[in-house]
Amino acid sequence: ESLGTEQRVVGRVAEVSGPEPSQQEQLVFGSGDAVELSCPPPGGGPMGPTVWVKDGAGLVPSERVLVGPQRLQVLNASHEDSGAYSCRQRLTQLVLCHFSVRVTDAPSSGDDEDGEDEAEDTGVDTGAPYWTRPERMDKKLLAVPAANTVRFRCPAAGNPTPSISWLKNGKEFRGEHRIGGIKLRHQQWSLVMESVVPSDRGNYTCVVENKFGSIRQTYTLDVLERSPHRPILQAGLPANQTAVLGSDVEFHCKVYSDAQPHIQWLKHVEVNGSKVGPDGTPYVTVLKSWISESVEADVRLRLANVSERDGGEYLCRATNFIGVAEKAFWLSVHGPRAAEEELVEADEAGSVYAGEQKLISEEDLGGEQKLISEEDLHHHHHH
């Protein structure tokens, strides 16, 4: 039994990985930031007269609130500017765009690439580094919901122009230290992390130095999760891989969920020569399926002695009673021919089904469960 409709013998899975455009864009800004909301006309057609509304009330333009037909700017944002913003057709009140804006007591959140903190020629002959925007560095705690983008900034100057580096919890912090990577915008003196997860919590220190001196600033990041929440997949995992015929491959998927998630490894397959069914949704087969009892699951799919048949598109999917998260990834197999034999570590291999109709199965996955190797699933139950 599943959370979907009754399972057919052969079925298809609807694409969940590429969600349709969100009806409400979630935006997080730091106190003091400029909030910029853009609402282009649908389909590029004429917009007609519009009105911007916050929490149900029309916005009154001011020196701080700049209102245009397709764009809204709120300068020097504060807590009071948090809320639900929408752009509506003036006559019909039809909502064209909808934004949820949250302004945090924090340096910044989100990658707005505003360029306003770019390095500048100070005109000073020589000098140790100094902060150019210290008023924007007062708030040292940034608390953002999981899956948001976070940006820390340390706008500085000096002569010669100082360098900037970043530490996490006192240790050098580089892109490879974080799944999903980081963006270092040296011109903006910023560190950007997309799709933050609980493991990103910690103290982030910018170190700005030149030959005349060094300054540093530490920010604390807390990643907030509502309980319960739908599963979150760590950004960047699983990663696409290329393998040589006959080699062994391992994929990683890191799942965060405080409500027992049903985790599945799936592979897109062909049925009667077709990759999709009559309704256009792709066929998949279940390679592995189990319930995780822990909040953080670092799960693995191992494919041994891969053959050309193992190449293709796979999915890591996590589902709980709130919702679904999934990530598609690819395996490319090439090179000298090896044995055609393939060994897939799978418990439901060959079971092709209507994936969205078997999104989660508390009932199926209950009852008899055997604990498989700790090395493989880190104490996750195997169905």
């Epitope: 959370l3 979907g4 409709t5 609807a14 969940v16 969600p19 027992q260 009673f321």
Partner: antibody, heavy 115, light 108 residues
């Protein structure tokens, strides 16, 4: 903050179809499960069914032959249709987020089945 | 379907006391798929506990859940005046997902 709002007629005649719509605000309807639950006059809670944003559904077997739940992601709405109603279907109907257990509820709408 | 039986039907206690509400299921529930809700008059139920023991966001820590298999308990360590309402348990391990009949907590 996610908010759900039920809408639809409060009075339905016996043998007709009860139709309710739930509008979700504060978050996208995508990637979540959405449920209908009702509370009968005796305060008993009954799960009616749920739908995923892709359109897949699951219903309470006791109501399955009469229930249809649909979703319109472009409007951030999902709907309930219950056919061939009788007085026993008189209840407060809630829409909620979640497939089984639910974390956000609408305020509920009373539907009375009477001629 | 799985039948949930809550006891007692009504529990009379005083503010400051400890409340223990019981929920028994007719079949064992896998993986602790049990939730507790609080319902105030004229309002929708509110999720308190899920996964048998996990507190939902915003729920005071005086509320705790425990149990496994067929026997589950909601404990309110120190009753506040606003806690004297109705509580429901729900199993979501097997369809149809069913609720208990409720326990009414009243001021003695």
């Amino acid at each position: 903050q996610v908010q759900l709002q039920e809408s639809g007629p409060g009075l339905v005649k016996p043998s007709e179809t009860l139709s309710l719509t739930c509008t979700v605000s504060g978050d996208s309807i995508n990637s979540y499960f959405w449920s209908w639950i009702r509370q009968l006059p005796g305060k008993e809670l009954e799960w009616i069914g749920h739908i995923y944003s892709s359109g897949s559904t699951r219903y309470n077997p006791s109501l399955q032959s009469r229930v249809t739940i649909s979703i319109d992601t472009s409007k951030n709405q999902f709907s309930l249709k219950l056919s061939s109603v009788t007085a026993a279907d008189t209840a407060v109907y809630y829409c909620a987020r979640g497939a089984s257990a639910v974390d956000y509820w609408g305020q509920g709408t009373l539907v009375t089945v009477s001629s | 379907e799985i039948v949930l039986t809550q006891s007692p039907g009504t529990l009379s206690l005083s503010p400051g006391e400890r409340a223990t509400l019981s929920c028994r299921t007719s079949q064992s529930i896998s993986s602790g798929y049990l939730a507790w809700y609080q319902q105030k008059p004229g309002q929708a139920p509110r999720l308190l506990i899920y996964g048998a023991s996990r507190r939902a966001t915003g729920i005071p820590d005086r509320f705790s859940g425990s149990g496994s298999g067929t026997d589950f308990t909601l404990t309110i360590s120190r009753l506040e005046p606003e806690d004297f309402v109705v509580y429901y348990c729900q199993q979501y391990g097997s369809s149809p997902y069913t609720f208990g009949q409720g326990t009414k907590l009243e001021i003695k």
